[in-house]
């Protein structure tokens, strides 16, 4: 027969989540209002479709991105669904209490909206490193750790280093992917004899997984500009990022050749690398000044992206237990890392050029920041990852890893796994 | 021509509320950030509070927070200053300014810069009783 | 917070001499730095930005250097119209607010 949601996990998912969700409503009741003094209808859709841009990234783009393996698809993209609206909620306010709360209610508007979905984002990208060895229970305390962890990062970074919203959000791409890879660390690792099949990749779940590429392709200048202060900077990010990602996709499809003896392309280094260009230019996108730059940056961040699909998996799978289709962790990583590495390369051309210690000092602020980010994201992902291990939360056992059907209902299957 | 005209101004007793409107005409509206800033008689320049280009991002001094909202609307070419529960200090003539993000480059690099490049020619308001 | 302090508070120069005017910021604001006139029942008038660049229309004699904590502002000849009010003005990344200095006043010797 098929195998149920084990009974533990009957009783504690839904109590647990309905008592968070009740208690968020209650927060909501009396800590928040909305913006009452918004006049400009109009501006306020134009404003929305920025949002807008992101949810889509976010639901479908990195709800489809995770769903490729062959007996994990519905979970993964359905459990990025219940992420990210839970993660939203608990940003908008986290976000309201760190930065507005002494002026008594914490006031939503369209830019909290935006700023939440971006911190949920995080938790999106982070998951894909433990997707298939956990349940819903244990993914809404990953969700509530690291979005505060990350809501807590952004606070302290501007304030001590006085960096805007775009400057600090930007810290994402190397804090959720360090983030997700500590948690994986933390983690059962070995997969049992009889379930290597399940987190291998299939044709069609591989489509569904290229489709939610496509959508954060398309929508990735939307991301990198969407918390600049000028529409000036916001073109400028939007163009530099289109540049970088079209290139990435050139190199990944034409790397990927290139690293097969066959000459073959590889979906998985594909899936992945089309984005390169995107995470590797978000720190500066708005600062280069011409497409020239930003392409290069692109052919750079995709060439890494396919060199590090080819080489890194065994060593993931081996160390953290990632499967090799879960790219997504040690890319970021690494794509996160070369954005911060060329804002800063920024800071010592202008250092050179100026001869100015006071920009000597930003390069070491920036350093500052950078290591920050990535030791809140490992500290905070162990703690995750310890309180994962916690038997409260039923995890699944490992020789139910990567499977649909520890967790859905088909009517038509007769048979079990 | 680019111009900024405010109105609103006036006579007001302590506690009391007034609002401030600010009429733009001569460039695109909706593209950029908006300031309100103040100067007390005989004093210099105190920054009040800024609006973003659309609406979505608002900051005060600390001087008026809770007491004072920024708001626009672009379909008007309107900026406004909500200000409530006045207070003596507030005595000031009361400037709309454009911020403009200019921004010059090196080869490998842009730097942006703010500043308000377009003033009114300000709205006196008197608080008193 | 950062806080701007400019010197000398007057500053008594004949015309056709050369005015330096100071602005020192109590932390870094790199380059992002303006500088303002103000005539008597005026409004403000944009002169410099990034420190050291003139705003459109700005006469060549007004020049802008400095970055950092340190900026000055130099009138390399006055005319009678550049006695006014001066003030310095910083922008600030987080939060994303406005600074003035408190103003020096370009008097005719």
């Known amino acids: 027969m098929s195998s149920k949601y084990p009974r533990s996990v009957r009783r504690c998912l839904p109590l647990w989540a309905l008592t968070l969700e009740a208690a968020l409503i209650l927060l909501f009741y009396f800590f928040t209002h909305y913006d009452a003094s918004l006049e400009d209808q109009k501006g306020l859709v134009a404003s929305y479709q920025v949002g807008q841009d992101l949810t889509v990234m976010a639901a479908i783009g990195l709800g489809f991105l995770t769903s490729s393996f062959r007996r994990h698809s519905w979970s993964s993209v359905a459990f990025n669904l219940f992420m990210l609206a839970l993660g939203v909620q608990w940003a908008i306010l986290l976000d309201g209490f760190l930065s507005q709360f002494p002026s008594g209610k914490v006031v939503i508007t369209l830019f909290s909206i935006r700023l939440a979905t971006m911190s949920a984002l995080s938790v999106l990208i982070s998951v894909d490193a433990v997707l298939g060895k956990v349940n819903l229970a244990q993914l809404v305390v990953m969700v509530l750790v690291e979005v505060t962890a990350l809501g807590n990062l952004r606070m302290v970074i501007s304030n001590i280093f006085n960096t805007d919203y775009h400057m600090n959000m930007m810290h994402i791409y190397v804090f959720a992917a360090y983030f997700g890879l500590s948690v994986a660390w933390c983690l059962p690792k070995p997969l049992p004899e009889g379930t290597e099949d399940k987190d291998q990749t299939a044709t069609i779940p591989s489509l569904s997984a290229m489709l939610g590429a496509l959508f954060l392709w398309m929508f990735w200048p939307s991301f990198n500009s969407a918390l600049l202060r000028s529409p000036i900077e916001r073109k400028n990010a939007v163009f530099n990022t289109y540049y970088a990602v079209a290139v990435s996709v050139v190199t990944a499809i034409s790397g990927s050749s290139l690293a097969h003896p066959q000459g073959k392309i590889s979906k998985t280094y594909v899936h992945s690398a089309v984005l390169a260009g995107g995470v590797a230019v978000g720190t500066s996108c708005h600062l280069i000044p011409s497409p020239w730059l930003a392409m290069v940056l692109g052919l750079v961040a995709g060439l890494i992206s396919v060199g590090g699909a080819k080489y890194l998996p065994g060593c993931c799978n081996r160390v953290l237990g990632i499967p090799h289709s879960s790219i997504m962790g040690y890319n970021f990583s690494l794509l996160g890392l070369l954005g911060e590495i060329i804002y800063i390369v920024l800071l010592v051309l202008d250092t050179v050029g100026a001869g100015n210690g006071m920009i000597g000092f930003q390069v070491l602020l920036s350093i500052g920041e950078l290591s920050l980010a990535i030791v809140i994201a490992l500290m905070s992902g162990l703690l995750t990852g310890l309180l994962l291990n916690l038997k409260i939360w039923k995890a699944p056992h490992e020789a139910k890893y990567f499977d649909d059907q520890v967790f859905w209902k088909f009517p038509h299957l007769a048979v079990g796994f | 021509q680019v111009q900024l005209v405010e109105s609103g101004g006036g006579v007001v007793q302590p506690g009391r509320s007034l609002r401030l409107s600010c009429a733009a005409s001569g460039f695109t509206f909706s593209s950029y950030a908006m300031h309100w800033v103040r100067q007390a008689p005989g004093k210099g320049l105190e920054w009040v509070a800024v609006i973003s280009y659309d609406g979505s991002n608002k900051y005060y001094a600390d001087s008026v927070k809770g007491r004072f909202t920024i708001s626009r609307d672009n379909s008007k070419n309107t900026l406004y200053l909500q200000m409530n529960s006045l207070r003596a200090e507030d005595t000031a003539v009361y400037y709309c300014a454009r911020e403009s993000t200019l921004y010059s480059s090196s080869w490998y690099r842009r730097y942006y810069y703010y500043s308000m490049d377009v003033w009114g020619q300000g709205t006196t308001v008197t608080v008193s009783s | 917070e950062i806080v701007l302090t400019q010197s000398p508070a007057t500053l008594s120069v004949s015309p056709g001499e050369r005015a330096t005017l100071s602005c020192r910021a109590s932390q870094s604001v790199t380059s992002n730095l303006a500088w303002y006139q103000q005539k008597p029942g005026q409004a403000p008038r944009l002169l410099i930005y990034?420190?050291?660049t003139r705003a459109t229309g700005v006469p060549a004699r007004f020049s802008g250097s400095g970055s950092g904590t340190e900026f000055s502002l130099t009138i390399s000849s006055l005319q009678s119209e550049d006695f006014a009010v001066y003030y310095c003005?910083?922008?600030?990344?987080?939060?994303?607010?406005?600074?003035f200095g408190p103003g020096t006043k370009l008097d005719i010797k």
């Open positions: 003005q910083q922008y600030n990344n987080w939060p994303p607010i406005f600074t």
């Open positions: 990034g420190a050291s």
